[in-house]
């Protein structure tokens, strides 16, 4: 009873339940491979509880181990398009601070038009995650085809 | 000590740990694209703790943000089969209540024989999730090749 | 307040937050399809909190339902390589104790060079998970391309 009350009284953030699910906003100019994300209930089913967006990139607010997941679908794509455009590659990494810059997750499209994956990784408050799509094919903005999210798992 | 005792005394359901992992039961008639799922320890490694099955579709019992994941493998498939039968598409969505109907997750097979993905999404008590496989290829019923599950993550 | 204090005082392990993320160490001799994993902060972003490695295979220390995830990328690979070497298949399963041996997750590469998936499954203390890569193509050891992990979800 006491635990249940305490659980209700404490703000969720103090339990460390940081979580975010983002939808694609736009790409940058052709020499900038980053995808720019957006989130919030007004946009549909995307949300940020803890992490924040900084110029379309996801910034972490709480140290811990996170499950990072992503799916990206190419907007104009058939298996022949995808193979003609090889290599089209998606990489998720820490892009700032520069001292912590590292690639966390990397996939190539080869003959497919969608990549999807997930991994556990330690992240620290202030880490900004960037998702780089190399190649010239545009990603789909459909919210069920392209999305990116993180979930705090443990300290 | 007190917290540990309280945690043991409280039923798990009150902590919001709803979770389900389902295996494929069967497909419907050709004009019904839905996959029909089954779960329970008697069937192997599938289970439902909180959510329920309603005529083979998964119904949510607790409001919250969920991690939804799926893998579907086509039963008789090679890369040539998959491309010849293109488009074969898998979509996971809320199919009832009708007022909340929306596609959450969509993937095409293109030249592959398996799709797998996951995403975070808010779900409400009473939401029923449907998994629609469009195209003429049948999915594999092997429990290590085709499965569908949800995990409650936070309120 | 009392809950917050209790949460800080209790070791994380007693809350059941077992989690591991591993990177590829090496493959075995050609007649041994298992991948051999390694983990620890000295190696980069891999870690073991609860589970242990036993000769490169992951051993579970706590009963519960786990999210198991994996990504494997083939080292020297194009869509033509992948299709020419078909079937290259990745299977994750319980390999010991022998009485609990079962395949949990299986994917073929077909014309792709990366597979990635995840599933929920019950695991018991002492279960050892093996990841079998059949075929002659070698996996990439890049830590952002090939990884394997588990996360305790609930009892």
């Amino acid at each position: 009873q006491r635990f249940a009350q305490a659980q209700q009284q404490l703000p969720l953030e103090s339990l460390g339940w940081d979580v975010a699910e983002l939808q694609l906003n736009h790409t940058g100019p052709q020499q900038d491979p980053r995808l720019y994300w957006q989130g919030g209930p007004a946009l549909g089913r995307s949300f940020l509880h803890g992490p924040e967006l900084d110029k379309g990139q996801l910034r972490i607010h709480r140290d811990g181990i996170y499950m990072v997941h992503i799916q990206v679908t190419l907007a104009i794509c058939s298996s022949t398009t995808a193979s003609r455009h090889h290599p089209t590659t998606l990489a998720v990494g820490i892009c700032s601070p520069a001292s912590r810059s590292i690639s966390l997750l990397r996939l190539s499209f080869h003959q497919g038009c969608t990549i999807a994956s997930q991994r556990l990784t330690p992240l620290a408050r202030g880490d900004t995650l960037c998702t780089n799509l190399t190649g010239t094919l545009l990603p789909s903005r459909n919210t069920d085809e392209t999305f990116f999210g993180v979930q705090w798992v443990r300290p | 000590q007190r917290f540990a005792q309280a945690q043991q005394q409280l039923p798990l359901e009150s902590l919001g740990w709803d979770v389900a992992e389902l295996q494929l039961n069967h497909t419907g008639p050709q004009q019904d694209p839905r996959l029909y799922w089954q779960g329970g320890p008697a069937l192997g490694r599938s289970f439902l703790h909180g959510p329920e099955l309603d005529k083979g579709q998964l119904r949510i019992h607790r409001d919250g943000i969920y991690m939804v994941h799926i893998q579907v493998t086509l039963a008789i498939c090679s890369s040539t089969t998959a491309s010849r039968h293109h488009p074969t598409t898998l979509a996971v969505g809320i199919c009832s209540p009708a007022s909340r109907s929306i596609s959450l997750l969509r993937l095409s097979f293109h030249q592959g024989c398996t799709i797998a993905s996951q995403r975070l999404t808010p779900l409400a008590r009473g939401d029923t999730l449907c998994t629609n496989l469009t195209g003429t290829l049948l999915p594999s019923r092997n429990t290590d090749e085709t499965f569908f599950g949800v995990q409650w993550v936070r309120p | 307040q009392r809950f917050a204090q209790a949460q800080q005082q209790l070791p994380l392990e007693s809350l059941g937050w077992d989690v591991a993320e591993l990177q590829l160490n090496h493959t075995g001799p050609q007649q041994d399809p298992r991948l051999y994993w390694q983990g620890g902060p000295a190696l980069g972003r891999s870690f073991l909190h609860g589970p242990e490695l036993d000769k490169g295979q992951l051993r579970i220390h706590r009963d519960g339902i786990y999210m198991v995830h994996i990504q494997v990328t083939l080292a020297i690979c194009s869509s033509t390589t992948a299709s020419r070497h078909h079937p290259t298949t990745l299977a994750v399963g319980i390999c010991s104790p022998a009485s609990r041996s079962i395949s949990l997750l299986r994917l073929s590469f077909h014309q792709g060079c990366t597979i990635a998936s995840q599933r929920l499954t019950p695991l018991a203390r002492g279960d050892t998970l093996c990841t079998n890569l059949t075929g002659t193509l070698l996996p990439s050891r890049n830590t952002d391309e090939t990884f394997f992990g588990v996360q305790w979800v609930r009892p």
């Epitope: 906003n25 736009h26 940058g28 052709q30 020499q31 720019y36 010239t136 545009l138 990603p139 903005r141 | - | -």
Partner: nanobody, 112 residues
């Protein structure tokens, strides 16, 4: 200021042709992948064709062989030549630069 302006839409009979144009500011035209999207009545917006700064072009399967996207570097224009039009091509057509900048759209109606 307006970044992208479409023109060329209209009513055409099935089997006919139309040419859509999208005028872009120089800084956008020179730096972004340009694409045409369309939104049929009551449906989601979908990609039709795209062209990179180097001129490489890609098409949605349903328009391949019927539509041609091109860049006019002298005028900062992206054109979409549409032929063998079908009733299912009826939609509002939008020009976009990297999904970041969008035109206001131009209506294309194909009657049977």
């Amino acid at each position: 200021e307006v970044q992208l302006v479409e023109s060329g839409g209209g009513l055409v009979q099935a089997g006919g042709s139309l040419r859509l144009s999208c005028a872009a500011s120089e800084s956008i035209f020179n730096n972004y992948v340009m694409a045409w999207y369309r939104q049929p009545p009551g449906k989601q917006r979908e990609a039709v064709a795209q062209i990179s700064t180097d001129g490489s072009a890609y098409y949605q399967d349903r328009v391949k062989g019927r539509f041609t996207i091109s860049r006019d570097n002298a005028k900062n224009l992206v054109n979409l030549q549409m032929s063998s039009l079908k009733p299912e091509d009826t939609a509002v057509y939008y020009c976009t630069a990297g999904l970041q900048y969008w035109g206001q759209g131009t209506q294309v109606t194909v009657s049977s």
